[in-house]
Interface confidence: medium
């Protein structure tokens, strides 16, 4: 299964929105900001299975979606941007399950839960504990919607790796028919 | 109310297979992880697998990998346990468990529980 | 794998009395979010195990407030702080912290 080509173009579409959803300064913020610890290993690695890309961002994109749907964010945030973050979030999670299971189905196994799932919950529950001791202050979410830009683009960068991956295997697999 | 109902444990010979069930109710089955443990003779508790909402991802200890296939069919609201190559040391009350998820915290804690089903191996 | 340890029994004790029951990790439990992934099971007799504390220190729903826990991420603690007769049964440590999930051999509560 590839990617769907417009996966790409809603996780761009996905930052985009983020950056509109600014409402403060950061530079107003910068006494609250705090290190996550983004897993960075988990996007970096070079030997990458199609499975794990698309486990680590389908969980990434269900956690950011779960912390932008609560009763909290739509007090901090724009409601038409929200809807529209949730909107296309919602997109990119379909797509990627389509995807996984017939990933899966072709017995690549995703191996999801032992790496990507439990260490990005572990992850957005940082964030989580964070929103909570700010008091869910705008400083907070302005420190968090940065956080989540810097983490999507990490994870967006991994799956443009993989589509190039999967282009180089097409040609090289056309080199030797 | 929250409920897990248990079924298929059986006695089965060393090698054989057997299928456990667990139906829910009470709640949105799907959108909560779910788990079968296992409590051996001695009493202690021993985690089997554990299966997202979707069910799009699973995992084993290595005790039971490549033995037991954890699965759900979410429009019957049922959990499953296929066990196969079956050894005496999988003698135990198997119990299933829904994951804690509420709130958005995505926590593994197992917050309901069913009433357990026994399987016995021996020959 | 994450070994927990507990003793198998606690010591006796009476009703209406606070008792303690002790657990330990083979490594620390805190993770770098702030969060410890400590947890905390009952089986009262002839039933399935319940849910009492999670994350190290919070009470699941529907527990009574005489339950407390605390640690430092590998010393853990349970605490009744007025044992009543239906607070008999096995306790079990477990850890979330990684894969595979373990829990401890279990503790029984003895009443004098």
């Known amino acids: 299964c590839d990617l769907p080509q417009n996966h790409g173009l809603l996780s761009r579409n996905t930052l985009v929105l983020l950056h509109q959803m600014r409402r403060i300064s950061p530079f107003l913020c910068l006494k609250d900001r705090r290190d996550f610890r983004f897993p960075q290993e988990m996007v970096k690695g070079s030997q990458l299975q199609k499975a794990q890309v698309m486990s680590v961002l389908h969980e990434m994109l269900q956690q950011i979606f779960s912390l932008f749907h609560t009763e909290r964010s739509s007090a901090a945030w724009n409601m038409t941007l929200l809807d529209q973050l949730h909107t296309g979030l919602h997109q990119q999670l379909q797509h990627l399950e389509t995807c996984l299971l017939q990933v899966m189905g072709e017995g690549e196994s995703a191996g999801a839960i032992s790496s990507p799932a439990l260490t990005l919950r572990r992850y957005f529950q940082g964030i989580r504990v964070y929103l909570k001791e700010k008091k869910y202050s705008d400083c907070a979410w302005e420190v968090v919607r940065m956080e989540i830009m810097k983490s999507l683009f990490l994870s967006t960068n991994m799956q443009e790796r993989l589509r190039s991956k999967d282009r180089d295997l097409g040609s090289s697999r056309n080199d030797s028919h | 109310e929250v409920q897990l109902q248990q079924s298929g444990g059986d006695l089965v010979k060393p090698g054989g297979s057997l299928k456990l069930s667990c139906a829910a109710s009470?709640?949105?089955?799907?959108?909560?992880?779910m788990s079968w443990v296992r409590q051996t003779p001695d009493k202690r508790l021993d985690w089997v697998s554990i299966?997202?909402?979707?069910?799009?991802?699973?995992y084993y200890p290595d005790s039971v990998k490549g033995r037991f296939t954890i699965s759900r069919d979410n429009a019957k609201n049922t959990l499953y346990l296929q066990m196969s190559s079956l050894k005496s040391e999988d003698t135990a009350m198997y119990y299933c468990?829904?994951?804690?998820?509420?709130?958005?915290?995505?926590?593994?804690?197992?917050?309901?529980w069913g009433q357990g089903t026994s399987v016995t191996v021996s020959s | 794998d994450i070994v927990m340890t507990q003793a198998a029994f606690s010591n006796p004790v009476t009703l209406g009395t606070s008792a303690s029951i002790s657990c330990r990790s083979s490594?620390?439990?805190?993770?770098?979010?702030?969060?410890?992934?400590l947890y905390w099971y009952l089986q009262k007799p002839g039933q399935s195990p319940q849910l009492l504390i999670y994350?190290?220190?919070n009470l699941a729903s529907g527990v009574p407030d005489r339950f407390s826990s605390s640690g430092s991420g590998i010393d853990f603690t349970l605490r009744i702080s007025r044992v009543e007769a239906e607070d008999v049964g096995a306790y079990y440590c477990?850890?979330?912290?990684?894969?595979?999930?373990?829990f401890g051999s279990g503790t029984k509560l003895e009443i004098k």
């Open positions: 299966i997202t909402s979707g069910g799009s991802y699973t």
């Open positions: 994350q190290m220190s």
């Open positions: 009470g709640f949105t089955f799907s959108s909560y992880g």
């Open positions: 490594k620390s439990l805190l993770h770098s979010n702030g969060i410890t992934y």
């Open positions: 468990a829904r994951h804690a998820e509420g709130g958005g915290n995505y926590d593994y804690a197992m917050d309901y």
């Open positions: 477990a850890q979330n912290l990684e894969l595979p999930f373990t």
